[in-house]
Interface confidence: low
């Protein structure tokens, strides 16, 4: 069960805390570790037995505005001969991340945190076979 | 959501850039989606590059639990169920954004933090370096 929103906090917090209207929070979108870089193995999207392509989605009312999504190239997996083996399946691997969504309402703007599901890459799996009686 | 006034001159002045600090609604959209990869699929066991999932727990972060993938083998599982070392299991990594309480102990003040997580593993053909 989830408890619904409780309204204002009743507690005395440290004096240095910034004042915040009820029902909202202050969010600094200057990112910690902003310059960290992914050091994945080279070209794994092409070298994988379940290769994938990348598509960049862009939305100026989202922060970050660019989100990269992967799409598996094949239904099956690539075998040692470089051919597609449809006895195996290429499947997407997904991960949740947070974004900030900006919404315009007339002359006002509001901000909302949102969880988005990002497809990160693909992996090759043995299929689940359902036998029909 | 929480509304805050836009620039004077609205509606002509369209604010192209996000401000450094914003007030956001506490309610996260899509907050209740399933975050446990063990429950959402069994790919980690069925993959030819299987992985284990390790729970990374940090109560000063949202989400407080993140699952990290560690490839089980250097090689990949072949059709006979054996590890084939002619292929490599490698982690697929992704940068994600999380919330970090800042300043510490302030209940309604956060900063976005970028963290690198290994989400799963994939089987790749190795890069072979030939020594002259």
């Amino acid at each position: 069960r989830k408890i619904p929103k409780v309204g204002h906090t009743f507690f005395q917090k440290p004096e240095s805390c910034p004042p915040v209207p009820g029902g909202s929070m202050k969010l600094d979108i200057g990112i910690i570790n902003e310059n960290q870089r992914v050091s994945m193995s080279r070209n794994i999207e092409s070298r994988s037995t379940s290769p994938w392509n990348y598509t960049v989605t862009w939305d100026p009312n989202r922060y970050p505005s660019e989100v990269v999504q992967a799409q598996c190239r094949n239904l099956g997996c690539i075998n040692a001969q470089g051919k597609e083996d449809i006895s195996m399946n290429s499947v997407p691997i997904q991960q949740e991340t947070l974004v900030v969504r900006r919404k315009h309402q007339g002359c006002s703007v509001s901000f909302q945190l949102e969880k988005v599901l990002v497809t990160v890459g693909c992996t090759c799996v043995t299929p689940v076979i359902h036998h029909v009686q | 959501g929480i509304t805050i006034p836009r620039n004077p001159g609205c509606p002509n002045s369209e604010d192209k850039n996000f401000p450094r600090t914003v007030m956001v609604n506490l309610n996260i959209h899509n907050r209740n989606t399933n975050t446990n990869p063990k429950r959402s699929s069994d790919y980690y066991n069925r993959s030819t590059s299987p992985w284990n999932l390790h729970r990374n727990e940090d109560p000063e972060r949202y989400p407080s639990v993140i699952w990290e993938a560690k490839c089980r083998h250097l090689g990949c599982i072949n059709a006979d169920g054996n590890v084939d070392y002619h292929m490599n299991s490698v982690p697929i990594q992704q940068e994600i954004l999380v919330l970090r309480r800042e300043p510490p102990h302030c209940p309604n003040s956060f900063r976005l933090e970028k963290i690198l997580v290994s989400v799963g593993c994939t089987c790749v053909t190795p890069i072979v370096h030939h020594v002259a």
């Epitope: - | 506490l26 996260i28 727990e57 109560p59 000063e60 949202y62 309480r101």
Partner: nanobody, 119 residues
């Protein structure tokens, strides 16, 4: 699986005392702030008390300050609420809740224990 089980509620006369307990399992108890939340009949939820991970800081809603004491035993994965000088307006279902970093939300909470203050 995360579980929170409250106990210790009951009928008590005004001015009396009760001690509520909450047994926690399925998560690293010592890593989380814990809360007592109550819901009076026909009313909304009210955050009663918070205790930090190591028990060093406690916070209370004004109406219970000086009467209620929140405590925890991390070795036993247990949370407590000592309620003294009880008043009729303390009548409510009391819930134990595990804190998430996002304020005003709890990701897990128990089934509740009813406290009735009446003469």
């Amino acid at each position: 699986e995360v579980q929170l089980v409250e106990s210790g509620g009951g009928l008590v006369q005004p001015g009396g005392s009760l001690r509520l307990s909450c047994a926690a399992s399925g998560f690293t108890f010592s890593s989380y702030s814990m809360y007592w939340v109550r819901q009076a009949p026909g009313k909304g939820l009210e955050w009663v008390a918070e205790i930090k991970q190591d028990g060093s800081e406690q916070y209370y809603v004004d109406s219970v300050k000086g009467r209620f004491t929140i405590s925890r035993d991390n070795a036993k994965n247990s949370l407590y609420l000592q309620m003294n000088s009880l008043r009729a307006e303390d009548t409510a279902v009391y819930y134990c809740a595990k804190g998430e970093i996002l304020p005003l939300y709890f990701d897990y909470w128990g089934q509740g224990t009813l406290v009735t203050v009446s003469s």
